[in-house]
């Protein structure tokens, strides 16, 4: 009866949609990798299902994943990080979907952190500042940022700046005097690797200076 | 029809350096793995280093780290071995692979031969 049952099961497994989608993280915790996986439905009973990857993996064939409520996870360092894995969906011994990826294409950054906007009277300027982890890092070194900032009454009306640096100068008349302003940053690989944008690091707030009147200018 | 052509190999005497090339014709060359392979007189084909799609990862067997560099130049789809410090031992067909699919090397190419004399 229970063989009949698993069957059936299995079965019913093979009407739902099982796409999935990736991603890694490079030394992430000291030289140890990561490897997130998520079904693309939130509504797939993940009951039975697991994830595995074979192939360019480092002294072994293939590598099962922990399940940390509705994601797949992996730390490891023996991902090859050279050529691909095949990252299937499995039920028991039987594949439902499979995928075939190499790890550095599908790269995704440690958010940037330590944002912070100082003001420069003098120069009627304001310097963004921010760190990145990956400044340390062997592999994923070079990285694209994107700096956004909003005045905070503006709920949807982002200014972008791209930049490779960790430094970026906002003119002081390109921003509205005496104004709440809400900026972020996130990062993305750039050369050598592929794949996502970070998470945004934590907003930082800071306010634009009055006009001064006599002269017309910001206070 | 010929996909991967090796070339760079000869007689050099132990000590010396040869630099060994390998030209792909496969239109996936600048996304695919490549690596270097070879085989000695009556051994098997062994596996000396590989470099990933964009040459940030490499990966060397014990018997050349240190002494082997292997590179790539994606616009002009063809990947490098710099052997230097050769030994008797290094004689041998050398083999470039390309694309390496879940432990399997799709395409291989014939070999160019190196003979390293004492």
């Known amino acids: 009866e229970s063989g009949y049952a698993q069957n059936g099961d299995l079965e019913d497994a093979e009407l739902d949609d099982y796409s999935f989608s990736c991603y890694s993280q490079l030394e992430v915790n000291g030289s140890q990798h990561s490897l997130t996986c998520a079904f693309e439905d939130p509504d797939v009973n993940t009951t039975n299902l697991e994830f595995e990857i074979c192939g360019a993996l480092v002294e072994v064939k293939c590598l099962n994943f922990r399940k940390l409520q509705e994601i797949y996870f992996i730390e490891t360092k023996k991902f090859l990080l050279i050529g691909k894995s095949n990252i299937c969906v499995k039920v028991g011994e039987k594949s439902l979907t499979c995928k075939k990826i190499d790890l550095t294409t599908i790269v995704k950054p440690e958010a940037p952190f330590d944002l912070s906007v100082i003001y420069r009277e003098g120069a009627n300027d304001f310097v963004v500042t921010f760190n990145t982890s990956h400044l340390q890092k062997k592999y994923v070194k070079v990285l694209m940022h994107d700096v956004a900032y909003r005045q905070e009454k503006d709920e949807n009306k982002w200014t972008h700046v791209n930049l490779s640096s960790t430094k970026l100068t906002l003119l002081q008349r390109k921003l509205q005097p005496a104004a709440m302003y809400e900026i972020k940053v996130r990062s993305i690989p750039d050369h050598y690797f592929k794949g996502f944008w970070s998470e945004w690091s934590p907003s930082y707030y800071f306010r634009t200076p009055e006009i001064n009147n006599s002269s017309g200018e910001m206070d | 029809e010929v996909q991967l052509v090796e070339s760079g190999g000869g007689l050099v005497q132990a000590g010396g350096s040869l630099r060994l090339s390998c030209e792909s014709s496969?239109?996936?060359?600048?996304?695919?793995?490549m690596g270097w392979f070879r085989q000695a007189p009556g051994k098997e084909r062994e596996f000396l280093a590989a470099?990933?799609?964009?040459?940030?990862?490499?990966h060397y067997s014990d018997s050349v780290q240190g002494r082997f560099t292997i590179s790539r130049d994606n616009a002009k789809n063809t990947l490098y071995l710099q052997m230097n410090s050769l030994k008797s031992e290094d004689t041998g067909r050398y083999y470039c692979?390309?694309?390496?699919?879940?432990?399997?090397?799709?395409?291989w190419g014939q070999g160019t031969q190196v003979t390293v004399s004492s």
């Open positions: 692979a390309e694309d390496y699919d879940t432990d399997v090397w799709q395409y």
């Open positions: 496969i239109s996936t060359f600048s996304s695919d793995a």
């Open positions: 470099i990933g799609w964009s040459g940030a990862v490499t």
